[in-house]
Interface confidence: medium
């Protein structure tokens, strides 16, 4: 399928003029080849009518321009002077020959309709209202006032003076005047549908001395916008529909044939197909609104519409807006794997892609709920603190540059099951979607900390250990300490990472971490963790409580200063610990005035432009240690 | 996206005149079909006039034939409109709008068809 992509279907009249974009994929090869219009002949060939290397044809000539916008992906075709001869069908492509990639188009120009010379065009949009302006002289004011639809043979009544309505305008017709004014009167109809088209006449007064004007009614469905947007990423509908709408229901639908089936309405209703994955915002009070989707599918293009009714359904004669959308294939944005599994007290990693050219970007994860209109409270971010019910047990690790920042979650329960959202204040496009599915466990977990309850006395030295299983052994071993803004990564060094192996003691492997002497700010969340590379894998977590001596009753500070701490190797003494320096990690103060704003994405997280860098490093200096024994043969 | 400023609104008594400016910055200009809007207080945004890319089509309401003119100068990006003969229905805020998508023909009258617009410049036209 060509990524190609355009409006399929233009129409205008002669003498008018047409500006057809088509888009294509972000790639520089695309952004810098040839781009072309020609028409297709009988044959199947396409012959070459205006291309971006300077070719113009002689029936173009001074008529017509082609212009790339290489920073939008699209190039836009300008033809004037049409005449009924350019009605055909024509493709808008990319390459160096004219079967390159492509995308057809189909033009009709029409002759102007013959219209009596005195006609006065409305022209308004389906379910819209308007207003006719109806003059007359002032002899026919006491007169009968009229508008009537004319149809082939003979003109059918609208509305009159003396309150005859036609009955398919019944509720929709008023005829009025204004104040004092006896020279016009005028006829509103409202919720505009195509079956109002056509020639009408207002007329006062009877016979050869009536007043009488020509109107043309043009009721349009709207043009569809298109939509260009990659696999998997995300796409807002921005619907104004305008303020007399401002109070109905509104939905967003997908054409299928004749009819439009509702994905989302502000009465509760969704698509299945969109769950997890969609959001629907009212933007203000006048009619506005916006619909997101998420992780966007194949199946996902086709023809939308979003309207506003009472019922939340599509309604003929009810204002409309439409968009054709297009999901190119050819994605920037990674396959990942949209359901991540887990189980009861274990752990999560999961990989979030950004755009690498947006690595100093803010990141954040929320949680999709699907009460109401759809919302995503972020739980976590760069610079939005850990919500309070995930304390020691979620983080965000930003790694700058590489496209990827990770969202670990651990002691996981089958309440963390559901839908979760990455996304950041940069390239909206990149918002992913991941389901979240927590199974029972079955088994014991792969990493496990002794001892279980962990209460360290003030002053003195404190050791707890990881257990991990021998398909861990390559894999780097970490622990850090938590706070609400990070997991911040104790040193380590791998003893026996160095030292050659020829079998593996499942019992022994083990990575420890000491805090000698213990103070009243190492309370708090530890976690033991694997990772290879940039690549986080499972953790486990544990709260270690800090007592006095004196087995006093235990204090739970939540600050997170920096604190000094010597590190003891497993099973060496522990005068022969290592001393590390204190590390003076500067707190980041938190710029993120918006914070609010960001905490939940039904407000277009997006568009708040708070700046600065991740605040994941809490201060602490820790270190830990990995030791394994060996058996040598 | 092409960003536009308009200017030259103001306070005139009927049957007086008044030039509108809009000022288009980003890049080509000259790609972009431009018209005029008013909306006038409780009333919907209605299309004033309309010119094509390259200033060869325009197109105008049938309550200004005449008394109003729409021209572009695309080497300096800039869009105007002569009023004439000004009416006190003529009260509105004029809005300077663009678009690259454009199907010509009826479809030249409706807003939805501008992706671009400029905040507006008040007229106001006193009898």
């Known amino acids: 399928k060509s990524p190609i992509f355009g409006p399929q279907e233009v129409s205008s009249i002669e003498g008018d003029s047409v500006s057809i974009t088509c888009y294509y994929p972000d790639t520089s090869v695309n952004r810098h080849t040839r781009k072309y219009w020609c028409r297709q002949g009988a044959s199947g060939m396409c012959t070459t009518l205006i291309s971006s290397n300077g070719y113009l044809s002689k029936e173009y000539s001074g008529r017509a321009n082609l212009i790339n916008f290489p920073e939008n992906n699209t190039f836009v075709i300008n033809i004037e002077q049409l005449t009924q001869d350019d009605t055909g069908s024509y493709k808008c492509g990319l390459g160096t020959s004219n079967r390159g990639l492509s995308f057809d188009v189909s033009l009709e120009v029409s002759q102007v309709p013959e219209l009596p010379s005195d006609t006065h065009v409305y022209t308004k949009d389906i379910g819209r209202n308007v207003t006719i302006e109806c003059p007359f002289k002032r002899e026919n004011a006491p007169s009968k006032k009229s508008l009537c639809k004319k149809t082939n043979q003979s003109c059918e009544l609208v509305i009159d003076s003396t309150e005859k309505v036609n009955p398919s305008y019944i509720g929709r017709a008023k005829l009025f005047m204004k104040g004092t004014d006896l020279t016009v009167f005028y006829v509103n109809i409202s919720h505009l549908t195509h079956n109002d088209a056509g020639l009408y006449i207002c007329q006062a007064g009877e016979g050869p001395s009536a007043d009488k004007k020509n109107v043309d009614l043009q009721v349009l469905a709207p043009e569809p916008e298109l939509l260009y947007k990659d696999l998997r990423s995300s796409v807002t509908f921005e619907c104004d529909l305008g303020r007399e709408v401002a109070n109905e229901a509104k939905y967003l639908c997908r054409m299928n044939k004749e009819t439009c089936d509702v994905i989302i309405n502000t009465l509760g209703k969704r698509d299945p197909d969109f769950e997890g994955r969609i959001l629907i915002t009212p933007k203000d009070d006048n009619g506005r609104f916006s619909v997101l989707i998420t992780g966007l599918r194949k199946e996902d293009a086709g023809h939308y519409q979003c309207g506003a009714h009472s019922s939340g359904l599509p309604q003929e004669g009810w204002p409309i807006q439409t968009w054709q959308l297009f999901v190119n294939e050819e994605s920037t944005i990674p396959n990942r794997r949209s359901v991540v599994k887990g189980v009861t007290g274990g752990s999560v990693a999961i990989a979030c892609p950004y755009n690498p050219k947006e690595s100093s970007s803010l990141k954040y994860w929320c949680r999709w709920e699907g009460d109401g209109n759809g919302h995503c409270p972020v739980l976590v971010g760069t610079q939005a603190q850990v919500q309070e019910e995930y304390e020691g047990r979620l983080a965000l690790f930003d790694q700058p540059g590489n496209g990827t920042y990770t969202v670990i979650l651990n002691q996981l329960t089958t309440e963390d099951a559901g839908f979760y959202w990455c996304l950041t204040n940069g390239d909206s496009r990149w918002r992913t979607t991941i389901e979240l599915q927590v199974a029972e466990a079955t088994r014991e977990p792969n990493l496990e900390v002794t001892p279980q309850n962990a209460t360290a006395v003030l002053g003195e030295t404190f050791t707890v250990s990881c257990h991990y299983p021998c398909k861990f052994y390559s894999q780097e071993k970490y622990w850090c300490k938590w706070s609400n803004k990070g997991c911040h990564i104790l040193p380590s060094h791998d003893e026996g990472a160095r030292q050659s192996s020829v079998s593996c003691d499942q019992s022994s492997q083990l990575v420890s971490m000491t805090l000698n002497p213990v103070s009243k700010e190492d309370e708090g969340w530890y976690w033991c963790g694997v990772k290879q590379g940039q690549t986080y894998g499972e953790t486990t977590a544990i709260y270690i409580a800090v007592e006095e001596r004196t087995r006093g009753s235990s204090h739970v500070n939540p600050t997170d200063a920096n604190a000094r701490a010597k590190v003891a190797l497993e099973e060496e003494v522990v005068d022969s610990s290592i001393s590390e320096k204190e590390n003076k990690a500067i707190p980041n103060p938190g710029p993120f005035a918006n914070e609010r704003e960001i905490q939940n994405v039904g407000d277009q997280a997006q568009e708040n432009r708070a700046s600065g860098d991740a605040g994941s490093a809490d201060g602490q200096s820790r270190s830990s240690s990995s030791k394994h024994h060996h058996h040598h043969h | 996206q092409v960003q536009l400023v308009e200017s030259g609104g103001g306070l005139v008594q009927a049957g007086g005149s008044l030039r509108l400016s809009c000022a288009a910055s980003?890049?080509?200009?000259?790609?972009?079909?431009m018209g005029w809007f008013r909306q006038a207080p409780g009333k919907e945004r209605d299309l004033v006039a309309v010119?094509?890319?390259?200033?060869?089509?325009?197109s105008y309401a049938d309550s200004v034939k005449g008394r109003f003119t729409i021209a572009r100068d695309n080497a300096n990006a800039r869009l105007y409109l002569e009023m004439t003969s000004l009416k006190p229905e003529d009260t509105a805020i004029y809005y300077c709008?663009?678009?690259?998508?454009?199907?010509?023909?009826?479809?030249?009258?409706?807003?939805?068809?501008?992706?671009?617009w400029g905040q507006g410049t008040q007229v106001t036209v006193s009898s």
């Open positions: 010119v094509t890319w390259s200033g060869g089509g325009t």
């Open positions: 709008a663009a678009t690259q998508d454009w199907y010509g023909g009826t479809r030249a009258f409706r807003a939805a068809s501008f992706h671009s």
């Open positions: 980003g890049r080509s200009f000259s790609s972009y079909n």
